[in-house]
C-alpha cells in the first residue's frame, strides 16, 4: 500500500492529525523534499551573519558574514574576524606574523617561509610577513 504522505510535495508537510493531508509549511519554515511529516525552521542570519539567500518554502536560508569577518564551518556555521595580510588571529586578537613566517590572506595562520636550500636553490626574493620567499636557481 502506498504511503499517502508520499504525495505531499516539497514545501508542505503531511499532517498526521488531519488524515494525512498536505499542509503548507508556515512562514519561515521549509521542507526540501516530498513526503515530510515536518517542516524545518528556517535559519536566521542575525548579528554578525547576513542573509546570502532568503529562506523559501522549499529551501533553507543561507548566511555569510558581515564585512570584516569570514565564514568557518559547514554552511557558514561561524563567523571569524578578519585580520590583515601579515597577521594571524589569536585569542588576544590579530597579531603580526613572527619573523620567518608569513600570511598572504585575511584568515588562517602564519606559515614558515619556504626553505629554498632544501631544494638546492637560493633565495631570489626575501620573504616578508605578507609574502613567502621566492626561490631561484
Amino acid at each position: 500500500l502506498q504511503d499517502p504522505c508520499s504525495n505531499c510535495p516539497a514545501g508542505t508537510f503531511c499532517d498526521n492529525n488531519r488524515n494525512q493531508i498536505c499542509s503548507p509549511c508556515p512562514p519561515n519554515s521549509f521542507s526540501s523534499a516530498g513526503g515530510q511529516r515536518t517542516c524545518d525552521i528556517c535559519r536566521q542570519c542575525k548579528g554578525v551573519f547576513r542573509t546570502r539567500k532568503e529562506c523559501s518554502s522549499t529551501s533553507n536560508a543561507e548566511c555569510d558574514c558581515t564585512p570584516g569577518f569570514h565564514c568557518l564551518g559547514a554552511g557558514c556555521s561561524m563567523c571569524e574576524q578578519d585580520c590583515k595580510q601579515g597577521q594571524e588571529l589569536t585569542k588576544k586578537g590579530c597579531k603580526d606574523c613572527c619573523f620567518g613566517t608569513f600570511n598572504d590572506q585575511k584568515r588562517g595562520i602564519c606559515r614558515p617561509w619556504t626553505n629554498c636550500s632544501l631544494d638546492g636553490k637560493s633565495v631570489l626574493v626575501n620573504g616578508t610577513k605578507e609574502r613567502d620567499v621566492v626561490c631561484g636557481p
Partner: nanobody, 120 residues
Framework: QVQLVESGGGTVQPGDSLRLSCAAS????????VGWFRQAPGKERQYVGT??????HYGDFENNRFTISRDNAKNTVYLQMDNLKPEDTAVYYC???????????????QGQGTQVTVSS
Amino acid sequence: QVQLVESGGGTVQPGDSLRLSCAASGRTFDNYAVGWFRQAPGKERQYVGTYWSGYAHYGDFENNRFTISRDNAKNTVYLQMDNLKPEDTAVYYCAISLKYPMATVTPDYQGQGTQVTVSS
C-alpha cells in the same frame, strides 16, 4: 544552557479555564518552534500542539478547546485551556524544536512540567 520553565498549573473544576505559561532562559524562542505535550499518570505522552511564526498546529483530541499563543516581548508562550475535563488531568510540558509541527518529533529541549488537575 537553555531552560524552559512552565507555570500556571493547578487544580480546577470541570468547565473551568487555565492558562499555562512557558518561559525560556538562556535562549529566546526566536528560532524555535514551541510545543506543548502532556502526560497523564500511567499513560503515554500526548502531543498537544506547536506554535511557529503565527501558526499553531494542534493534536487531534482537544476540539478547539486549547489555544497556543506567544508574547515575543516577554519571551513566553502560552497554552490557553478552556472547558477543561477530568481527562485533561496531566503534567503539561513545554518543549522547543527546529521542526514544525512537533507531533512526531523528539524535542531539542523540554521543561520540567506543570501539574493540571481537573476534578469536581
